[in-house]
């Protein structure tokens, strides 16, 4: 029997009947065995076929076999109902070998020319399967020359049989208090040859409850308990299962916080699997009852381990744990069924006793000592000497625990000193220097610091004075000893004030005239205003109408008297304003340099002399009564004058304060 070529030789060629293309002889039998490489098959087709036709090709025939299977028995020239001729058909081996047998019987009624066939090896596409046949691979099939291989979708691994895809379904741990788990691909059929392990692991104190839901379909057997595929449920206490078949198992109350679910499948079957919805329970905590004026959130039918609630108080109430205020409150249910924190109280917000108002007082409006939410208090300033600044003084205890004004301010109102109050009323006529009485010049300040000088209190922490009086102390403000509230220069009964800073007008040049002879002293503390210590007012825009020529101003101080000594008692003198040109002319003569009197100065005194301020009065205020407001204001600051105080034809020269209002206001607002 001739053999065809064998692999690894090239596998292709031609076969023909004996004597072809001539007629074949009788009683011929010829056999060819063709072999292709593994993973290949043989393809065969006929280019000529002319054999004796007989019933079921019993006489002459060509038989094609592959292994034990006969692929075809061929005869004749064309196919009939019972006989087959190859025609244009192509024949394929089932494996890698093909047997071809030619036989002719003892006679032919007429001559037949036989057959001619060609063959070749070709790759088998193992991935193509006939309908109804099992697929080559579980998931993905990849053909290649001489073979194929299988691969799996994500989440699966190729079984050692190289065809089946086993699910990677172990090691999943569920830690939430409830959830769902199911067989792989549920509700589609679950994978074969898989072993799945799922863990539910909750905190100690919880008990897992398993409910099988929707459908249950696991391969079973009528006689043996789950021999193929099965589901098992294991806790630290007991094992449940195995489960299989089509009936939903009953709820399982595990009484355990840890559960292991095992699902094992074999190589066959087509079942949809299972789905479990799990929940958990624990010992419930006592139902939280909200404190008065508070509410619980969230509201639940019951609260178990790890459940929590918060308490929120109504507006105007605050959380208190004992006596300690809390920003927030959340309690958590513990495994023993108790809450981790005791219930707080919602206590009405208490703003506490209101702060004392410097130079003022506070009155309880709602009730004596009532400082709780919505309580009202009224601040007021000490009458006569203080007035409240831009505020009605009414404060309400708000929900944030702060006393709040009607304008929403949380800061205290400000009691501003009333300025320009004096026990003295001006008489208008001029008379000699005389002793001041208590309360006449409550703004009068005695400044000691190398020399004796004066100043005037502004507000409750500033002193207005002359630049030349404090020039030497401008860099050592603390060296200034500032006294007020006394008439006697040598009395120990004064109010002591200390300088924090000295501000000398930038236009003042020491020892080069007295232009811009003005300075401010900032005190390091506010002084208490009373009948003996009261600030002087600054001039209003309209003040010049009270400071015309011949209008009376009053100068006060402890400066030199006619006897040539510093006065023991505060003295004052009423003097008229002098025409500016007249004053300028008086100081044009030597020894005074030209231009000594500037537009920033005003002059006051008698042409006849005798009434004047003198050394030691420097920095003190020349004051005027504003007849509209009935308050005294500072029009001038004692600055300079003739060498001999009170000299006829010479006048006291004062810094014109109205020219410096912006400077004063800027300094005070900035510092």
């Amino acid at each position: 029997t001739p053999l065809g070529p064998k692999w690894p030789e090239p596998v292709f060629g031609r076969l023909a009947s004996p004597g072809f293309p001539g007629e074949y002889a009788n009683d011929q039998e010829r056999r060819w065995t063709l072999t292709a490489p593994p993973g290949y098959r043989l393809r065969l087709y006929f280019t000529h076929f002319d054999l004796e036709l007989s019933h079921l090709c019993e006489y002459d025939f060509v038989k094609l076999s592959s292994g034990a299977k006969v692929l075809a028995t061929l005869c004749g020239q064309e196919s009939t109902d019972t006989e087959r001729a190859p025609g244009k058909d192509t024949f394929y081996s089932l494996g890698s070998s093909l047997d071809i047998t030619f036989r002719s019987d003892y006679s032919n009624e007429k001559p037949f020319t036989g057959f001619e066939a060609f063959y070749a090896a070709e790759d088998i596409d193992e991935c193509q399967v006939a309908p109804g046949e099992a697929p080559t691979c579980d998931h993905h099939c990849h053909n290649h020359l001489g073979g194929f291989y299988c691969s799996c979708r994500a989440g699966y691994v190729l079984h050692r049989n190289k065809r089946t895809c086993s699910a990677l379904c172990s090691g999943q741990v569920f830690t939430q208090r409830s959830g769902e788990l199911s067989s792989p691909e549920y509700p589609r059929p679950y994978p074969k040859l898989s072993s799945c392990t799922y863990s539910i692991s909750l905190e100690e104190g919880f008990s897992v409850i398993l409910d099988f839901v929707e459908s249950f379909d696991v391969e079973t057997h009528p006689e043996t308990l789950c021999p193929y595929d099965f589901l098992k449920i294991q806790t630290d206490r007991e094992e449940h299962g195995p489960f299989c078949g089509k009936t939903l198992p009953h709820r399982i109350e595990t009484k355990s916080n840890t559960v292991t679910i095992t699902f094992v499948t074999d190589e066959s079957g087509d079942h949809t699997g299972w789905k479990i919805h799990y929940t958990s329970t624990a010992q419930p905590c006592p139902y939280p009852m909200a404190p008065p004026n508070g509410h619980v959130s969230p509201v639940q039918a019951k609260y178990i381990l790890k459940d929590s609630f918060s308490i929120f108080c109504e507006t105007g109430y605050e959380l208190l744990q004992g006596h300690l205020p809390l920003k927030s409150f959340t309690a958590v249910c513990q495994k023993d069924g108790s809450w981790d924190r005791p219930m707080p109280a919602c206590s009405i917000v208490d703003c506490g006793p209101p702060d004392d108002l410097p130079s003022g007082r506070v009155e309880y409006i709602t009730g004596p000592g009532v400082t709780t939410y919505k309580a009202v208090i009224q601040y007021s300033c000490e009458e006569t000497f203080y007035t409240m600044k831009v505020n009605d003084g009414k404060y309400v205890c708000e929900a944030d625990g702060f006393w709040t004004s009607s304008k929403g301010e949380k800061s205290l109102p400000v009691c501003e000193p009333v300025c320009g109050l004096s026990a003295r009323t001006t008489g208008g006529r001029i008379y000699g220097g005389q002793k001041a009485k208590p309360g006449d010049f409550p703004w009068q300040v005695l400044i000691l610091g190398g020399t004796t000088a004066a100043g005037a209190l502004l507000y409750d922490n500033w002193v207005l004075t002359a630049a030349h009086a404090v020039y030497e102390q401008k860099h050592d403000a603390s060296a200034l000893d500032i006294r007020m509230g006394t008439l006697k220069r040598l009395s120990p009964h004064y109010t002591q004030a200390w300088s924090e800073a000295v501000f000398i007008h930038e236009g003042y040049t020491h020892d080069a005239g007295f232009d811009n002879d003005i300075a401010l002293i900032k005190l390091n503390n506010k002084v208490v205003i009373n009948s003996n210590i009261t600030p002087i007012c600054l001039p209003r825009k309209e003040a010049e109408s009270f400071m015309r020529t011949d209008d009376i101003g009053t100068a006060s101080g402890w400066g030199l008297t006619q006897r040539g000594f510093l006065a023991r008692n505060l003295m004052y003198v009423d003097i008229p304003i002098v025409d500016h040109q007249k004053c300028t002319a008086a100081y044009e003569k030597p020894p005074y340099p030209r231009g000594s009197v500037t537009a920033n100065m005003l002059c006051a005194g008698l042409e006849s002399g005798g009434k004047d301020s003198c050394r030691g009065d420097s920095g003190g205020a020349l004051v005027f009564l504003d007849s509209e407001t009935e308050r005294w204001f500072v029009g001038g600051i004692v600055s300079w004058g003739s060498m001999n105080c009170g000299e006829a034809g010479q006048y006291g020269v004062y810094t014109k304060v109205i020219n410096y209002i912006p400077w004063i206001e800027n300094i005070i607002s900035d510092f």
């Epitope: 000893d481 006697k488 040598l490 009395s491 120990p492 002591q496 023991r568």
Partner: antibody, heavy 121, light 106 residues
Framework: QVQLVQSGAEVKKPGASVKVSCKAS????????MHWLRQAPGQGLEWIGD????????HYIEKFKDRATLTIDKSSSTAYMELSSLRSEDTAVYYC??????????????WGQGTLVTVSS | DIQLTQSPSSLSASVGDRVTITCSAS?????MYWYQQKPGKAPKLLIY???NLASGVPSRFSGSGSGTDNTLTISSLQPEDFATYYC?????????FGQGTKVEIK
Amino acid sequence: QVQLVQSGAEVKKPGASVKVSCKASGYTFTNYWMHWLRQAPGQGLEWIGDIDASDSETHYIEKFKDRATLTIDKSSSTAYMELSSLRSEDTAVYYCARGDITTTLRYFDVWGQGTLVTVSS
Amino acid sequence: DIQLTQSPSSLSASVGDRVTITCSASSSVRYMYWYQQKPGKAPKLLIYDTSNLASGVPSRFSGSGSGTDNTLTISSLQPEDFATYYCQQWSSYPLTFGQGTKVEIK
């Protein structure tokens, strides 16, 4: 030299009054304030009040406002302190002291020798 | 009223020792004054305006401090310095004294 000489020791019954004198010399009496202080046995110093020798302006601490009276006799340069409604706790050495007039005016540069006042029934 | 607290209340020291007495005020004071008192005698001014030595007072005495804390220092204690020392303030009415510090011979 500047000195203050006080009157001698006194023994008084409770409810009585005592008047202690303090004669100044060696300075201009009316230029200064005179202060009065006391010291109970084994105790510290306590200020009572003061008087301006020039015009008799007085100041007392609250405790002594109703019982102490400070006066001046310019002609003899003498200051007086009278304490009424005496009680046993008023037993003390009473001092007059001159107030400084050079700096703060708030301390005592010259002291009398002290007068012991004993209040006992 | 401003309270003045002296410390120590008493101390024992030897001739030549350096002695420091402190006076603590309940509120800030601008100036402190110090007096020395010997048994049966009137007090005598030592220091005025915190740090100035009164007339006739030996230079071994010195004062310092500010605010609420003031100190009297005797740099080298002499036999005649054994006495009681008082601080005094009048920054705030009424004037007040400390309770005294007794310096005794060791």
